[in-house]
Interface confidence: medium
């Protein structure tokens, strides 16, 4: 058993059919030491008396808010939270595998340039009786700061018959240099609570290879004379790093077609602007991916041919 | 990045020009080297991330771009200030700083070089002769050397009379090449800076 | 001991706003992890979950009827409300409310209030 | 919203028999999953919570079982007083369902 916060314990069981349990000792936070009776979840049943309370802890039934009472007056709580292991492995009901990029994803994480700032996020259909908490730090055995707000719900999407909700947190590095070469991972670890069940998530990785540029800015056509060529000019998003001839990017610029079926044109470019033939009903997207480290292309920022 | 990409005119500033190809060449030795080894610990998550360079060059604190100089955390370490010689400058645009932080880099290929030689000769002798160094990788290396034109005494190749432990060579080759790859990223940025002032 | 305990109009016509209130006795909305929820039952037929409301004043409403729920409470009376506005004959049912603890089942029921609707 | 489908509709028993009602979660509902008890003229009474566990004060004859989308509700030896119509719910998402109910009639 282990503290989660101020009077909230998590109990880590074996979960297997007659699993024996865990013997958890809860003691009165109280300088009482006669008269004190326990009861769990407000229910009026006297569990026993005494200044500590003896419980066996086997299921979901035996966790929940213990609470000591003196003369009709409560003197402490004590929430009791079961985190379970199946076959040695930690339970994920909580949380959707998000599956990409591999198996057993379940947050997800990005970085719009090199300042030490990423958000995650992370998917689960249940709707109620949910709490998060993130804590974040560069590298385990000697931890360096990170800094994560809260975890707010930040989409619901309808999947078939499913509803999913998304979360994401923001986080930055207490001290980043955005030209640091990286050689300890940033960790991030989630606490999960649905109702009485406790699951943790972690996820590991360096900021370089979750970096996704914001699509670029300003992307404007200007036709050339007596051709049906047109120049793409676009600028470096503003939230990329700088100065930006240290931090590059490189450009993708596609032609396509109004039907999906049509061929596309793409050219790769390190300049910020283009030459391309513009079709008519076509359009012209330019997305951007950092020049020496290929982490994701970010988005496409598109602009009609007409 | 094997798109048809459009480069800058190397002819301003030839250094540049060789480190977009050490990036490149060191990118696809490390490809090669993930699919080749693909049951050894070969991944960035896998591996351990070590620079052999730490506390013996100090490139990304000399390299350091000016605009990031007023950044704190970016400070930490330096006891030197910005940014250069050798032949990629003009003699004009020469600074001390600059000279410090190309000297850093001519230091990180110089060792990398040898460590690389190194263990080429080992993975020579591995009977199932399973993965070896690119050449175009150690012939980059050595343009750009070439190209930075620093004079230093050649360091003599590490020889070891005993067996090697291929299986420990071949992690410790994943190893070199994911930092090295990480260096070459570092050395690629600070080239282009150098080539727009 | 907990108690909880409906009362309405008894009858209304259509279109008219149903409100409902729950008194109950034996735990307190000031508490963390107690909520209170209501709950319908036609007659002869199933239950329907309403809405339910967390001792933060978290709220949520089943979506099918949302735009015409509103639950409220007044922790200090330990009275909780239901309005359901432009009723018509299909809400006619046996209203509960029900105490929704930490084990997240009704663990407690009001006897329930009967509601009809006509005109 | 989850649809919990509750069978059987109907069960006629006698005393001593055993019975066992299922209700199957349109989609996985971990294991927040009630059973609850309603006699004639009487508010729904809680039985097991948590799929499996019994609430206080409930005869050890009730008892449930499963998992995600199935699950098993059995009164190993049917007493009269078991008169009711018993009813699954899942308060793992909201909207918070039932299923439609087990009448339960003793021969």
């Known amino acids: 058993i282990w503290e989660l916060k101020k009077d909230v314990y998590v109990v880590e069981l074996d979960w297997y059919p007659d699993a024996p349990g865990e013997m958890v000792v809860l003691t009165c936070d109280t300088p009482e030491e006669d008269g004190i009776t326990w009861t769990l979840d407000q229910s009026s049943e006297v569990l026993g008396s005494g200044k500590t309370l003896t419980i066996q802890v086997k299921e979901f039934g035996d966790a929940g808010q213990y609470t000591c009472h003196k003369g009709g007056e409560v003197l402490s709580h004590s929430l009791l939270l079961l985190h379970k292991k199946e076959d040695g492995i930690w339970s994920t009901d909580i949380l959707k595998d998000q599956k990409e990029p591999k198996n057993k994803t379940f947050l997800r994480c990005e970085a719009k340039n090199y300042s030490g700032r990423f958000t995650c996020w992370w998917l689960t259909t249940i709707s109620t009786d949910l709490t998060f908490s993130v804590k974040s730090s560069r590298g385990s055995s000697d931890p360096q700061g990170v800094t994560c707000g809260a975890a707010t719900l930040s989409a619901e999407r309808v999947r078939g018959d499913n509803k999913e909700y998304e979360y994401s947190v923001e986080c930055q590095e207490d001290s980043a240099c955005p030209a640091a070469e990286e050689s300890l991972p940033i960790e991030v670890m989630v606490d999960a609570v649905h109702k009485l069940k406790y699951e943790n998530y972690t996820s590991s990785f360096f900021i370089r290879d979750i970096i996704k540029p914001d699509p670029p800015k300003n992307l404007q056509l200007k036709p050339l004379k007596n051709s049906r060529q047109v120049e793409v000019s676009w600028e470096y998003p503003d939230t990329w790093s700088t100065p930006h001839s240290y931090f590059s990017l490189t450009f993708c610029v596609q032609v396509q077609g109004k039907s999906k079926r049509e061929k596309k044109d793409r050219v790769f470019t390190d300049k910020t602007s283009a030459t391309v033939i513009c079709r008519k009903n076509a359009s012209i997207s330019v997305r951007a991916q950092d020049r020496y480290y290929s982490s994701s292309w970010s988005e496409w920022a598109s602009v009609p041919c007409s | 990045r094997n798109l048809p990409v459009a480069t800058p005119d190397p002819g301003m500033f030839p250094c540049l020009h060789h480190s977009q190809n050490l990036l490149r060449a060191v990118s696809n030795m490390l490809q090669k080297a993930r699919q080749t080894l693909e049951f050894y610990p070969c991944t960035s998550e896998e591996i351990d991330h070590e620079d052999i360079t730490k506390d013996k060059t100090s490139t990304v604190e000399a390299c350091l771009p000016l605009e990031l100089t007023k950044n704190e955390s970016c400070l930490n370490s330096r006891e030197t200030s910005f940014i250069t010689n050798g032949s990629c400058l003009a003699s004009r645009k020469t600074s001390f700083m600059m000279a410090l932080c190309l000297s850093s880099i001519y230091e990180d290929l110089k060792m990398y070089q040898v460590e690389f030689k190194t263990m080429n000769a080992k993975l020579l002798m591995d009977p199932k002769r399973q993965i070896f160094l690119d050449q175009n990788m150690l012939a980059v290396i050595d343009e750009l050397m070439q190209a930075l034109n620093f004079n230093s005494e050649t360091v003599p190749q590490k020889s070891s009379l005993e067996e090697p432990d291929f299986y420990k060579t071949k992690i410790k080759l994943c190893i070199l090449l994911h930092a090295f790859r990480i260096r070459a990223v570092t050395i690629d940025r600070v080239m282009s800076y150098l080539n727009a002032s | 001991q907990v108690t909880l305990k409906e009362s309405g109009p008894g009858i209304l016509q259509p279109s008219q706003t149903l409100s409902l209130t729950c008194s109950f006795s034996?735990?307190?909305?000031?508490?963390?992890?107690?909520?209170v929820s209501w709950i319908r039952q036609p007659s002869g037929k199933g239950l329907e979950w309403l809405a339910h409301i967390y001792w933060d004043d978290d709220k949520y409403y089943n979506p099918s009827l949302k735009s015409r729920l509103t639950i409220s409470k007044d922790p200090s009376r330990n009275q909780v409300f239901l309005k359901i506005t432009s009723v018509d004959t299909a809400d006619a049912a046996t209203y509960y409310c029900?105490?929704?603890?930490?084990?997240?089942?009704?663990?407690?029921w009001g006897q329930g209030t009967s509601v009809t609707v006509s005109s | 919203s989850v649809v919990m489908t509750q069978t059987p509709k109907f069960l006629l028993v006698s005393a001593g028999d055993r019975v066992t009602i299922t209700c199957k979660a349109s989609q996985s509902v971990s294991n927040d999953v009630a059973w609850y008890q309603q006699k004639p003229g009487q508010s729904p009474k809680l039985l097991i919570y948590?799929?499996?566990n019994r609430y206080t004060g409930v005869p050890d004859r009730f008892t449930g079982s499963g998992y995600g989308t199935d699950f098993t509700f059995i009164i190993s030896t049917v007493r009269a007083e078991d008169l009711a119509v018993y009813f699954c719910?899942?308060?793992?998402?909201?909207?918070?369902?039932f299923g439609g109910g087990t009448k339960l009639e003793i021969k």
């Open positions: 948590y799929a499996s």
């Open positions: 029900t105490r929704r603890g930490i084990r997240s089942a009704m663990d407690y």
């Open positions: 719910q899942q308060d793992y998402n909201s909207p918070w369902t």
């Open positions: 034996g735990f307190s909305l000031r508490k963390s992890v107690m909520g």
